[in-house]
Interface confidence: low
């Protein structure tokens, strides 16, 4: 009952004499495990016996396997799923039907498999894509309906009998669906492969040839062209003729159109395999090629470079670099279209020929301002001399020249003036755009190139300016030569070196630190009274009356400056001493009498001594002598002596009269 048995295996298996066959097979018996299996060769059902007749290649029963007369047939299956078989080696007479007789406890089944064994190894089959185009990658497939674990084989690709360098990928299939060996080769055919023979060769494990398949490649490609030119070097002169011929060396499919191109642009009305150029001009110089098209596309020949020789064209000059900086290097290049290239050049500067300059380039290592101007050139080749072109301008840039700092003020300049200076220059390229001043004082610049110094100092500043374009050029410094009144005037005592005593010789000096102009006059003053006009003020014998506040003045043409007041101090011993009495020189007894020692002294009196009419010193040392109460016996002449650090002085006698009081007289 077929509904109870399900088999899967290849329908037909292929092999050759001496090889092997591996039959992948699966089955399912729905009513239980397999109990008996017999492999028949070409089985025939015998209706009389209700059994199959035929050669039994393999047999197994529930008692176990029955050894066959040869071990070349193996059942590799099991009792419920696998029915795989192997025949190794396989022989020509194994061709035909293989019958798998299967019996379970209740059911029987005969499964038939076709085996095709050839006398010699059969060839593989090459599969090609429907169309092959040059440079497009294709996959070539070589297929052989054979694979067996016991008989390794290999597939080798050959092009025109030579092994192909490209790596092939070989795969095998031994499944219930299919049994094969396949080799795939990725390949980018070139037009030159068209018509070539590709072979897939079947080899055994040792590389021995077994069989092969061959195909001829049909590679579609654009036309392949060769261009020929007369003259062969493609060098002509204006007026000559040139012939170019286009030859098709290969085209698949056949070509359809022909055209010619110059410098990549199609030439009109040139659709034949020959291009004739008559009386060529220099404009016809260029790269020529022919183009032939077929269904695949256009093919182009190699380019022929046609050179039409002519005399130089009017030249132009290129300057590297302009504007040029003074002192830098400059290169001039003479550019003139010519064929062949010019061999000689003539150079001109401002229309005048530059001697000894015959090269394409002129190099000036150190540019100076006079190099500025128009440069032109003439080129020459074997065909003639060109014309001089318009030329090029060289602009030579340099720092400002001959820069000077100019004082605009009327001279002389006086301290406190506002000084205006200008910065002048002779020439400059490019134009002066700014100015700088040294020293960089905190000054004002009301306009470019002019510096205004307000309230100029006395200290004789030197000023320099720079005129600047891209560079700064400094002028030599100019001295402002500022004139000013005498400075730092002071009184200085020259002698004596120590303190001044009455009677000393004294000299005072009027000093000042500086004056511009140098010519000065001196004035000495005491209490607004002019004393002298020399730098020194001298006292042969100083007296106390000379003491006081002295000033000296120094003046020049700019102005006069006074010193601070200087105090002259004269030291002398006490003098002009006298004794004064209070309330008077006649005093009544019992009252109070005060005697004062008055004096003139410098320094002041430090010590007093009192004397009576007997020249007896009294025990009193202060300036005042107080008698209280005064007695009649105090009457008499008194004098005093004053002492300071310089010396002593004494007063004349002064008489004190003490008279009796009315009370005393009354008692008498």
């Amino acid at each position: 009952d077929s509904s109870k048995w399900v088999f899967e295996h290849p329908e037909t298996l292929y092999a050759w004499e001496g090889a092997c066959v591996w039959i992948p097979c699966t089955y399912r018996a729905l009513d239980g495990d397999l109990e008996s299996f017999i492999l028949f060769h070409n089985p025939e059902y015998n209706k009389n016996t209700s059994k199959f007749d035929g050669t039994r290649l393999y047999e197994s029963t529930k008692d176990g396997k029955v050894p066959s007369e040869q071990k070349r047939v193996q059942f590799l299956g099991d009792k419920n799923k696998n029915c795989t078989l192997s025949i190794h080696p396989v022989h020509l007479n194994d061709s035909g039907q293989l019958g798998l007789r299967m019996e379970s406890k209740t059911e029987k089944w005969m499964e038939r498999i076709h085996l095709n064994v050839s006398e010699r190894p059969f060839p593989p089959h090459i599969q090609l894509p429907p169309e092959i185009q040059e440079s497009q990658e294709v996959t070539l497939t070589c297929l052989l309906n054979f694979s067996c674990y016991g008989y390794p084989i290999q597939l080798q690709w050959l092009l025109e009998g030579v092994p192909m360098r490209q790596a092939a990928v070989t795969s095998t299939s031994l499944t219930i669906k299919s049994v094969f060996t396949r080799s795939e080769l990725k390949f980018s055919p070139q037009w030159s492969h068209h018509g070539k023979i590709v072979t897939c060769q079947l080899q055994d494990a040792d590389g021995k040839f077994l069989s092969n398949d061959t195909v001829q490649l049909n590679v579609k490609h654009t036309p392949k062209l060769e261009i020929k030119v007369t003259p062969s070097d493609a060098i002509v002169r204006e007026g000559d003729s040139v012939t170019m011929t286009c030859e098709v060396s290969s085209s698949n499919p056949e070509y359809t159109t022909v055209s010619w191109l110059k410098d990549g642009t199609s030439l009109k009305k040139q659709n034949t395999f020959t291009l004739n150029l008559r009386e060529v001009t220099k404009d016809q110089s260029g790269k020529y090629c022919c183009q032939v098209s077929n269904d695949v596309g256009p093919g182009r020949s190699e380019e022929v470079f046609l050179q039409v020789q002519y005399a130089p064209e009017p030249s132009t000059v290129q300057i590297l670099h302009s504007p040029a900086v003074e002192g830098s290097q400059v290169e001039f290049l003479c550019m003139s279209l010519a064929n062949p290239l010019p061999t000689n050049y003539t150079w001109y500067h401002n229309g005048k020929e530059m001697q000894g300059r015959t090269e394409e380039k002129v190099h000036i290592p150190k540019i100076l301002p006079w190099h500025a101007g128009t440069y032109s050139c003439v080129a020459e080749n074997i065909l003639g001399t060109g014309q001089r072109g318009p030329g090029a301008e060289l602009d030579v840039q340099y720092p400002p020249k001959k820069v000077t700092t100019v004082i605009q003020n009327p001279m002389p300049i006086r301290e406190g003036d506002t000084v205006t200076l200008s910065c002048n220059y002779n020439s400059s390229n490019p134009s002066v755009t700014r100015y700088e001043w040294k020293p960089h004082g905190a000054w004002e610049e009301p306009s470019l190139g002019v510096l205004k110094i307000q309230n100029v100092g006395w200290d004789n500043t030197t000023i320099a300016c720079a005129a600047c374009n891209s560079w700064c050029s400094w002028a030599s410094p100019v001295a402002l030569n500022v004139q000013y009144a005498p400075r730092d005037v002071r009184v200085r005592k020259i002698k004596p070196l120590s303190e001044i005593h009455s009677g000393n010789s004294v000299s005072l000096q009027c000093d000042f630190s500086s004056s511009h102009p140098k010519e000065v006059q001196f004035f000495w003053e005491k209490n607004g009274r002019l004393l002298g006009k020399e730098s020194q003020l001298n006292f042969d014998s100083i007296s106390p009356e000379d003491a006081g506040s002295y000033s000296c003045w120094v003046n020049n043409s700019i102005g006069q400056t006074a010193s601070k007041a200087w105090t002259l101090e004269v030291l002398y011993a006490p003098r002009r001493l006298r004794v004064s009495m209070s309330p008077g020189d006649q005093v009544m007894e019992g009252k109070s009498a005060t005697l004062t020692c008055e004096s003139d002294a410098n320094p002041p009196v430090s010590h007093y001594t009192w004397f009576d009419w007997n020249n007896q010193s009294l025990p009193y040392h202060s300036q005042k002598l107080r008698l209280e109460p005064v007695k009649v016996q105090h009457s008499g002449a008194y004098w005093c002596q004053g002492t300071n650090s310089v010396g002593k002085g004494r007063s004349p006698l002064s008489t004190l009269t003490v008279y009796y009081s009315p009370e005393t007289i009354g008692r008498r």
Partner: antibody, heavy 120, light 107 residues
Framework: EVQLLESGGGLVQPGGSLRLSCAAS????????MSWVRQAPGKGLEWVSA????????YYADSVKGRFTISRDNSKNTLYLQMNSLRAEDTAVYYC?????????????WGQGTTVTVSS | DIQMTQSPSTLSASVGDRVTITCRAS??????LAWYQQKPGKAPKLLIY???SLESGVPSRFSGSGSGTEFTLTISSLQPDDFATYYC?????????FGGGTKVEIK
Amino acid sequence: EVQLLESGGGLVQPGGSLRLSCAASGFTFSSYAMSWVRQAPGKGLEWVSAISGSGGSTYYADSVKGRFTISRDNSKNTLYLQMNSLRAEDTAVYYCAKVGISSLHGMDVWGQGTTVTVSS
Amino acid sequence: DIQMTQSPSTLSASVGDRVTITCRASQSISSWLAWYQQKPGKAPKLLIYKASSLESGVPSRFSGSGSGTEFTLTISSLQPDDFATYYCQQYERFPWTFGGGTKVEIK
């Protein structure tokens, strides 16, 4: 790097004196005018004094004229401000500043300042 | 002496705002004007000199204009770093004088 560093500030009694210094580095000191600017606490900026690059020209605000003296020692790259007869209103942060070339550029570099406090 | 008057004295603005500060001189000072920025506890920084020239390293959002007696400092798009006090200063003649300052604060 152009730098200005002031020093010499401190507490001083009215009528006293103080000398501020400003050490310059990173530029050609003698080529530039220099200036002192002060700022009283919570107030705006007040220009005090300026001196030319050579030291030959000096300029003062009316409020300090006769009491303050600006000077410089180009060999030491140092700017000075001698402040005499100080008053309470002189209390401020004192900045020294570099004056741009020829006064075209204002005061382009400033120090961090030094504080002067005048108080009894 | 030349008096410099700045306005406004205080200005409240937000990040991204266009800010304009004005400075007026009591007499013509040509173009001799500088603008400074000062942050608390720091020294002033020069922004603009000669009325409109941008000091090296100062962002291009700062610009100055004017001549004679009327001058303007403009910040095209205020950034967080720009909140500070700004001073103008004339150096046309001595004594140099500053404006009273404009404090730019966050709105």
